[in-house]
């Protein structure tokens, strides 16, 4: 089977939202935890973690094979604590199997905007912390 | 064993809003799809919306997009359906069940006893 | 959307008679399509999962054919709690969808 992990976010308002995104196969669902962590390079684990997630089991619909599961972390304000390196993980706690996203960093700046940085290649997000817009 | 109990009786005035809820007991329900139904007098089954209470997903009809809401409570396994902005062609009975195991039961295997909704001025 | 049409609205039969209900999907589902069987004043309850597969408690004079667009739930000997009104239903895409029933009444 092919288990993938992808990490994006979204701004709305002043809200920041985190999101890990498993996409996966029925049968692959049973024991699979997605979870989210920050600063946490080597022991990120779903104990350690932010927010966890069982995957989905059931699409909802028969006529599908991959089921999309999303884990959303919301910042409701980001503050200069948010600041860190942020990574989506899953693991199987019935085969073991273990999966890591790439890091993605939150960056406070002096003018109280902060940038997300690391989502995807050649994807640089920037937002005004005050005005809440994306530019 | 597996239930679903369901919010009592409303009658509603047009323009208002209700909310109907759905207490699910006996299996894991995070782990579920929760579907709900509505069946007008004497008039079949038309299907509102869906929700996965494990991650919140919730698939809607086009119909009722924008107008119904589904949400869930993992803490009480409660799930609810709202509706705004009634009219008097939303009075009906309002349902929801359990879709079972996808490749396993696949249709919808429990059900609530019904909420019955009557709007009118 | 996948819609579904059932057949004859209104069946009229004897108790011991044969009933041969029809659905039909307006785009191919495989087998994803359930029966389901609502007497006045409940909930309806499922009697056939996945076009043909039985379900536990449901007795055996039920049963389910069918396969792409064409379904049929046959009742072998009808019982005198069989006369209702009877749903298909599709779990192959969003949105999911009932056909419009199918009443089997005594004659």
């Known amino acids: 089977g092919c288990i993938n992990i992808t990490s994006s976010a979204s701004q709305e308002g002043t809200r920041l939202n985190l999101i890990c995104t498993v996409w996966h196969k029925k049968e692959e669902a049973e024991g699979f935890v997605v979870f989210l962590c920050k600063d946490r390079s080597g022991d990120c684990s779903p104990e350690t973690s932010l927010k966890q997630l069982r995957l989905k089991r059931d699409p909802g619909i028969d006529g599908v094979g991959e089921i999309s599961s999303q884990l959303m972390f919301t910042i409701s304000q980001v503050t200069p604590l948010h600041s860190g390196t942020y990574q989506c993980c899953a693991r199987s706690q019935k085969s073991g199997i273990r999966l890591q996203g790439h890091f993605f960093s939150i960056l406070f700046t002096e003018t109280g905007n902060y940038t997300v940085t690391g989502l995807k290649q050649r994807q640089h997000l920037e937002f005004s912390h005050n005005e809440g817009t994306l530019s | 064993q597996v239930q679903l109990v369901q919010s009592g009786a409303e009658v509603k005035k047009p323009g208002a809003s209700v909310k109907v809820s759905c207490k699910a007991s006996?299996?894991?329900?995070?782990?579920?799809?929760m579907q709900w139904i509505r069946q007008a007098p004497g008039q079949g089954l038309e299907w509102i919306g869906a929700?996965?209470?494990?991650?919140?997903?919730?698939q809607y009809t086009q119909k009722f997009r924008g107008r119904a809401t589904l949400t869930a409570d993992k803490s009480t396994s409660t799930a609810y359906m709202e509706l705004s902005s009634l009219r008097s062609e939303d009075t009906a009975v309002y349902y929801c069940?359990?879709?079972?195991?996808?490749?396993?039961?696949?249709?919808?295997?429990?059900w609530g006893q019904g909420t019955t909704l009557t709007v009118s001025s | 959307e996948i819609v579904l049409t059932q057949s004859p609205a209104t069946l009229s039969l004897s108790p011991g008679e044969r009933a041969t209900l029809s659905c039909r999907a307006s785009?191919?589902?495989?087998?994803?399509l359930h029966w389901y069987q609502q007497k006045p004043g409940q909930a309806p309850r499922l009697l056939i999962k996945?076009?043909?597969q039985s379900i536990s408690g449901i007795p055996a004079r039920f049963s389910g054919s069918g396969s792409g667009t064409d379904f049929t739930l046959t009742i072998s000997s009808l019982e005198p709690e069989d006369f209702a009104v009877y749903f298909c239903?599709?779990?192959?895409?969003?949105?999911?969808?009932f056909g419009g029933g199918t009443k089997v009444e005594i004659k």
């Open positions: 239903q599709q779990s192959n895409s969003w949105p999911l969808t």
């Open positions: 785009q191919s589902i495989s087998n994803h």
């Open positions: 929700i996965y209470p494990g991650d919140d997903d919730a």
């Open positions: 996945y076009a043909s």
């Open positions: 069940a359990r879709r079972g195991i996808a490749a396993v039961v696949g249709g919808f295997d429990y």
């Open positions: 006996g299996y894991t329900f995070a782990d579920y799809w």
